[in-house]
Amino acid sequence: MNGSEYFVKIQSFLGGAPTEDLKALSQQNVSMDLATFMKLRTDAVLPLTVAEVQKLLGPHVEGLKAEERHRPVRDWILRQRQDDLDTLGLGLQGGIPNGYLVLDLSMQEALSGTPCLLGP
């Protein structure tokens, strides 16, 4: 069974998938469509790297642009380095500026919904 066939079989169960499962899926050429990606748990999507999301979505990655202001895409973009987002060539905006340090302050983030940044 190839990645696409596997994806079709598990598609309806993906809404509650944890980060680890999404990371594993990204290695299987599943080419997840944006409609499915948008239904994923935000907390499961946030830890994914740009490379992992690119692999997970395959050719559908360009659809991130159209959804960049919708969750979970918006929140995921806020967690990525702008330099990494730029490698996709989609014109995605809102990533962490080059030279900034991300502090993983759980309480700060829980309150504000965004990571705490320290300038260069």
Epitope: A35, G63, A66, R69, H70
Partner: antibody
Framework: EVQLVQSGAEVKKPGASVKVSCKAS????????MDWVRQAPGQGLEWMGD????????IYNQKFSGRVTMTEDKSASTVYMELSSLRSEDTAVYYC????????????WGQGTTVTVSS | EIVLTQSPDFQSVTPKEKVTITCSAS???????LSWYQQKPDQSPKLLIY???NLASGVPSRFSGSGSGTDYTLTINSLEAEDAATYYC?????????FGGGTKVEIK
């Protein structure tokens, strides 16, 4: 056949609110965002915002922020656009338009709803 | 926001003639994020071209689109009477999404 059927024409007084509905049929409702675009008499097209029917997430054009609210009813495959604090400049034809999630173009449009704001 | 300026505003053309409509953006637009719509009198707009040059389903091949950066073009190669309409360009490269002011094409 894919169809978007909108509610009928409305006449409202300045300061009032209007709620326009858009019923979708012939496709998987949650695979497409629904956008709203308006057109004042003799004028061009103006994008108002969109709603993701799957999550209920909305994005609004800042020009309408605070005045526009988009909602959905998945069980009825219907989306709604409510515009409050109406003024004469809001007189226009309001269109719902389907946009596949992950794209930015509108491949199916409703027939339009004429909203007239007049005292 | 990105302002899309179309020219001409109005064009009166004889059948079989070639029509060229330009859409100039105030800032660069990624070509994948530009589309064209056709709106006939008293009708809803209809998708004509997406991603700058891709014809929407059912659109005749006499329509074509091209361009990049800030300059985009819609061409109707051999105008037919049914092409009388107003044409709009549209970008979703930058928020908020915007449309051009429209170009009305009339048949002589």
């Amino acid at each position: 056949e894919v169809q978007l059927v909108q509610s009928g024409a409305e006449v409202k007084k300045p300061g009032a609110s209007v709620k326009v509905s858009c019923k979708a049929s012939g496709y998987t409702f949650t695979d497409y965002n629904m956008d709203w675009v308006r057109q004042a008499p003799g004028q061009g097209l103006e994008w108002m915002g969109d709603i993701n029917p799957s999550t209920g997430g909305t994005i609004y054009n800042q020009k309408f922020s605070g005045r526009v609210t988009m909602t959905e009813d998945k069980s009825a495959s219907t989306v709604y656009m409510e515009l409050s604090s109406l003024r004469s400049e809001d007189t226009a034809v309001y269109y719902c338009a389907r946009r596949r999630i992950g794209t930015g173009y509108f491949d199916v449009w409703g027939q339009g709803t004429t909203v007239t704001v007049s005292s | 926001e990105i302002v899309l300026t179309q020219s001409p505003d109005f064009q009166s053309v004889t059948p079989k003639e070639k029509v060229t409509i330009t859409c100039s953006a105030s800032s660069s637009v990624i070509s994948s994020y530009l589309s064209w719509y056709q709106q006939k009198p008293d009708q809803s707009p209809k998708l004509l071209i997406y991603r700058t040059s891709n014809l929407a389903s059912g659109v005749p091949s006499r329509f074509s689109g091209s361009g990049s950066g800030t300059d985009y073009t819609l061409t109707i190669n051999s105008l037919e009477a049914e092409d009388a309409a107003t044409y709009y360009c549209h970008q979703w490269s930058s928020f908020p999404y915007t449309f051009g002011g429209g170009t009305k094409v009339e048949i002589k």
